[in-house]
C-alpha cells in the first residue's frame, strides 16, 4: 500500500521565523511529476495544490500568499516539503499533507508558534520637578506577560503595566511597563517579561546614566535659558514700546515655534 511517513509531526517555530514541514512518499527510480498530486491544507485553508507538474496559486488562501511554497527540488527525493516564511501566530494549527502517486495517503502535522518578548525596548527619563527617574520597558509577544521590576540587590519593585494589541498582528500583545523611582547614577534595574509557568523569561537591564543628555533635564534648560530669558524680557519690553502690534505677532509665532521644538527635544534618553 502507498504510505506517507513523517520523521516528525510536532513542529515549533518562533514568530517571524521560517519552518519547513515534510511528508515522505515512496519513489521508485525516476519521479513522474505529472503523475504526482500534492495537497497541503491547514484546517479549511488550501495552501498548496500541486497537480500536473505545477502549483495552482489561484486556490491558495490569501493568508499564505507569498509566504508558502512547495520545495520542488525535494519532490525528486520523495519529500513533499512545505516551507512557510515570516511565520505568524495564526499559522499555528494542524496541517494535512495529502499525496497521490499511484495510491494516496495523508498525514497530519501540528505546528506551534511562539512569540517570546525578546526585543525589549527601554527608555529612561527624569522628572524635572521631583528628580524621580521614570524607567520604561516595552515589548511584543504572546501570550500575555506580566512585567516584574527588580533592583540589582534583588528587591522587587512596583511598576505599572499596560497591555494592548499589537499593530503588527491581531493576536500579538504589546506590553509596556513603567517604574517611577528615585535612583542614582549607575544604579541597575531589571524589567522581566514573565508569562505564566516555568517557561523562558526575557529580561532587560537598565542602567541609570551619569547625566541625562541635554535637554532632558528642565533644570539644565533654566540654567542656560535663565539669563537669556531675562535679556529677552527686557528686549520685548523695549520692543513693545517701540514697535507696532502687528510686528509683535511674528515674534510670538516665532517663540511658539521655539517652545514646541524644545518640547520635541525633550523626548528623553532612549536605548533599545
Amino acid at each position: 500500500a502507498f504510505t506517507i511517513t513523517v520523521s516528525k509531526d510536532l513542529y515549533v517555530v518562533e514568530y517571524g521565523g521560517n519552518v519547513t514541514m515534510e511528508c515522505k512518499f515512496p519513489v521508485e527510480k525516476q519521479l513522474n511529476l505529472f503523475a504526482l498530486i500534492v495537497y497541503w491544507e491547514m484546517e479549511d485553508k488550501k495552501i498548496i495544490q500541486f497537480v500536473n507538474g505545477k502549483e495552482d496559486l489561484k486556490v491558495q488562501h490569501s493568508s499564505y500568499s507569498q509566504r508558502a511554497q512547495l520545495l520542488k527540488d525535494q519532490l525528486f527525493l520523495g519529500k513533499a516539503a512545505l516551507q512557510i516564511t515570516d511565520v505568524r501566530l495564526q499559522d499555528a494549527g494542524v496541517y494535512c499533507c495529502l499525496i497521490g502517486y499511484g495510491g494516496a495517503d495523508y498525514k497530519r502535522i501540528t505546528l506551534k508558534v511562539h512569540a517570546p518578548y525578546r526585543n525589549i525596548s527601554q527608555r529612561i527619563s527624569v522628572d524635572p520637578v521631583t528628580s524621580e527617574h521614570e524607567l520604561m520597558c516595552q515589548a511584543e509577544g504572546y501570550p500575555e506577560a506580566e512585567v516584574i521590576w527588580t533592583s540589582s540587590d534583588h528587591r522587587v519593585l512596583s511598576g505599572k503595566t499596560t497591555i494592548t494589541n499589537s499593530n503588527r498582528e491581531e493576536k500579538l500583545f504589546n506590553v509596556t511597563s513603567t517604574l517611577n523611582i528615585n535612583a542614582t547614577a549607575n544604579e541597575i534595574f531589571y524589567c522581566t517579561f514573565q508569562r505564566s509557568g516555568p517557561e523562558e523569561n526575557n529580561t532587560a537591564e537598565l542602567v541609570i546614566p551619569e547625566r541625562l543628555p541635554v535637554p532632558a533635564s528642565e533644570r539644565t534648560h533654566f540654567m542656560i535659558l535663565g539669563p537669556f530669558l531675562l535679556l529677552l524680557g527686557v528686549v520685548l519690553a523695549v520692543t513693545f514700546c517701540l514697535k507696532k502690534h502687528g510686528r509683535m505677532m511674528d515674534v510670538e509665532k516665532c517663540c511658539t515655534r521655539d517652545r514646541n521644538s524644545k518640547k520635541r527635544n525633550d523626548i528623553q534618553f532612549e536605548e533599545t
Partner: antibody, heavy 118, light 107 residues
C-alpha cells in the same frame, strides 16, 4: 501563580461514565491543554491534547472514541469525558498545561482518582 | 508509536554524590525530549526541556544531554529532596510517549 484545580474523580461501575473538570487560574486558555493518566503504581500515559481555542484535538488511537476533551474558555475550564469505563481505566487523571514554546507539560493539576469497579 | 526505554529502573545514591539516568527512543527524535520528576504523592514537574535546555526555577544541578535516540539526565550533586521517579517524554511524534520511569532512592 498558575493553578490547575481538578475535580470529578469518583468510583464508577464498569461501562459507566464520568466527567472530570480542570479549572485554570493565573492564565487564560492561550495554551493547549493535555490530559495524562497514571494507573496505581505505574508510569505516566499521555491521553491527548486539545488546542487553545478547542479547534483541534489529538487522541492516541487506543483511546479514541471513548474519551472526549472540551474547553469552556468563559469558565477557564477544561473537561475530560470518560465513557464506557473499564477496570483498566482506574488511574489518577492529570490535566496539564502544555508550554507555549514546545510540547512539554509546563504545569500540572493535582490529579483526580477515578476508580472503576463493580 | 515511539517507545521510550529508561535505564536503570532504580537508582540508589548518597546525598552529595552525582546520579545519572538514561532514556532511549525506538527511533530518532532529534532533541524532542523532556525530563520530569515526580515526588511521592505529588504531580510531576518539568526539569529539562528539549534534551538540554534548562527550565526557569529548576536548580542547575539537573543537566540534560543527548540527541537522536540516546539521552541522559545527570544530577551533579543529589540532595534529599531529589528522591522520586524521573520520567522522559518524547514530543517528536503523536502520540507523545513517556518512558517507564527511573526511581531515585537515597542511600
Amino acid at each position: 501563580e498558575v493553578q490547575l484545580v481538578q475535580s470529578g474523580g469518583d468510583l464508577v461501575k464498569p461501562g459507566g461514565s464520568v466527567r472530570l473538570s480542570c479549572v485554570a487560574s493565573g492564565f487564560t486558555f492561550s495554551y493547549a491543554m493535555s490530559w495524562v493518566r497514571q494507573a496505581p503504581g505505574k508510569g505516566l500515559q499521555w491521553m491527548g491534547t486539545i488546542s487553545d481555542g478547542g479547534s483541534y484535538t489529538h487522541y492516541p488511537d487506543n483511546l479514541m472514541g471513548r474519551f472526549t476533551f472540551s474547553l469552556d474558555t468563559a469558565k477557564n475550564t477544561a473537561y475530560l469525558q470518560l465513557n464506557s469505563l473499564r477496570a483498566e481505566d482506574t488511574a489518577v487523571y492529570y490535566c496539564a498545561r502544555e508550554s507555549y514554546d514546545g510540547y512539554y507539560v509546563a504545569n500540572w493539576g493535582q490529579g483526580t482518582l477515578v476508580t472503576v469497579s463493580s | 508509536d515511539i517507545v521510550m526505554t529508561q535505564t536503570p529502573l532504580s537508582l540508589s545514591v548518597s546525598p552529595g554524590e552525582p546520579a545519572s539516568m538514561s532514556c532511549r527512543a525506538s527511533q530518532s527524535i532529534s532533541n524532542n525530549l523532556h525530563w520530569y520528576r515526580q515526588k511521592p504523592g505529588q504531580s510531576p514537574q518539568v526539569l529539562v526541556k528539549y534534551a538540554s535546555q534548562s527550565i526557569s526555577g529548576v536548580p542547575d544541578r539537573f543537566i540534560g544531554s543527548g540527541s537522536g535516540t540516546d539521552f541522559t539526565l545527570r544530577i551533579s550533586r543529589v540532595e534529599a529532596d531529589d528522591l522520586g521517579v524521573y520520567y522522559c517524554q518524547q514530543s517528536n511524534s503523536w502520540p507523545q510517549t513517556f518512558g517507564q520511569g527511573t526511581k531515585l532512592e537515597l542511600k
